[in-house]
Interface confidence: low
């Protein structure tokens, strides 16, 4: 080549990423790389992740002479070592009056009576543990249940015989069953009294309730 096309190794500099070129011979050069880079022209970023300290499931993301940790949602901080307080971030994390309890790497809900599930959104099926008498129908409620009794049965658990079945109340009186003991209660029409509403009452008296 002519003198007008002389090769000068460091002009222009072949070193990239801030590397400094040093001519070592007529046609040779050496690149002094900035921290975080390697290769004959400093073209390669050194992977800092083999020595990473990302914790708790954090994923290492290489940087220039450094690395960052991409943390799972439950963790934060430079190395994913700081617990995220989900209870602060999500005030409504627990439903139906449940209390949020922050934990290392997550959170939990302390549910009020009658609710269950991770976020207290599931109504506990109280009928699963109910003792309604066979033949009756259990109805689940929040933290309780009720028993729908078949004809002839009464009481909270339908475990009592319905005393109204024998029509003990006379004169068109209304018959109710005491859910605690199964006894009938007659609500007498005007002018009658007594357990069965069979007695006349004095003028001026109105409805009477009689328990039996």
């Amino acid at each position: 080549a002519g003198s007008d096309s002389l090769y000068v190794p460091c002009a222009p500099s072949p070193c990239v990423n801030g590397g400094t070129c040093r001519q070592t011979g007529d046609f040779t050069f050496e690149c002094n790389c900035l921290p975080g880079f390697e290769g004959s022209t400093c073209e390669r970023n050194i992977d800092d992740c083999p020595n990473h300290r990302c914790q708790n499931g954090g994923v290492c993301v290489d940087g220039v002479n450094t690395y960052n940790c991409r943390c799972p949602p439950q963790w934060t901080g430079q190395f994913c070592t700081e617990d995220v307080d989900e209870c602060l971030l999500q005030p409504n994390a627990c439903q139906n009056g449940g209390t949020c309890a922050n934990r290392n790497g997550g959170y939990g809900c302390v549910c009020v009576n009658g609710w269950s599930g991770d976020d207290c959104s599931e109504n506990i099926d109280d009928c699963a543990f109910a003792s309604c008498t066979p033949g009756s129908t259990c109805i689940d409620r929040v933290a309780s249940f009720s028993c729908m009794c078949p004809e002839g049965k009464a009481g909270l658990l339908c475990h009592l015989d319905d005393a109204c079945i024998s029509n003990p109340c006379h004169k068109g009186a209304l018959c109710d069953t005491n859910p605690l003991n199964g006894q009938y209660i007659c609500t007498c029409p005007q002018g009658y009294k007594g357990a069965d509403c069979t007695e006349d009452v004095d003028e001026g008296n109105s409805h009477h309730h009689h328990h039996h």
Epitope: P50, N51, H52, R53, Q55, C60, Q78, F79
Partner: antibody, heavy 120, light 107 residues
Framework: EVQLVESGGGLVQPGGSLKLSCAVS????????MEWIRQASGKGLEWIAA??????????VYSASVKDRFTISRDTSKSTLYLQMNSLKTEDTAVYYC???????????WGQGTLVTVSS | DIQMTQSPSSVSASVGDRVTITCQTS??????LAWYQQKPGKSPKLLIY???RLQDGVPSRFSGSGSGTDYTLTISSLQPEDFATYYC?????????FGGGTKVEIK
Amino acid sequence: EVQLVESGGGLVQPGGSLKLSCAVSGFTFSDFYMEWIRQASGKGLEWIAAQRNKANDFSIVYSASVKDRFTISRDTSKSTLYLQMNSLKTEDTAVYYCSRDGGKWGLDAWGQGTLVTVSS
Amino acid sequence: DIQMTQSPSSVSASVGDRVTITCQTSEDIYSGLAWYQQKPGKSPKLLIYGASRLQDGVPSRFSGSGSGTDYTLTISSLQPEDFATYYCQQGFKYPLTFGGGTKVEIK
């Protein structure tokens, strides 16, 4: 209760091999980084090997002093950490500890240690 | 590798004394430092992690402080059971490295 119990130490000739075991219990083994640290008599602590957790593919790091001679591994089904030591030198004589990396820059559980003596 | 310079190498103190041990690192370790206590024939016990956080079950007379490259372990009122060797350790980058240790002896 977190427990780590090392075994397998003993007397071995220079150039020989030895395999140390560390049986762990009381925590989910695959969730934690595990480390081997050694201590020569009357000297300080020297970290020699680590195995990251399952989330980090159980990848491995060694100190320059044992690289290519020692191998760290674990059997999660047996909840046991191992250190296979080959081409042993007299300067490898030490008490070897396995420890659990608690995830916040601290080694929060240690075994009782097992003595390895390399001598002819 | 990150170099750990711990001082003093030994200290003589009496029960009730305040004892301070320092650890200097060769580069910023962003509070990634732990302190351990070791008694003869026993394995090390974690006292402080993350430069200043007290490990569960460790008495509150132990405290840690510092940032960047300079860290300190303080025992506010030395108790008979505290006579032991103490080590600092950086957990910021592999290889993990330890300080040379500080032996706390009875005066």
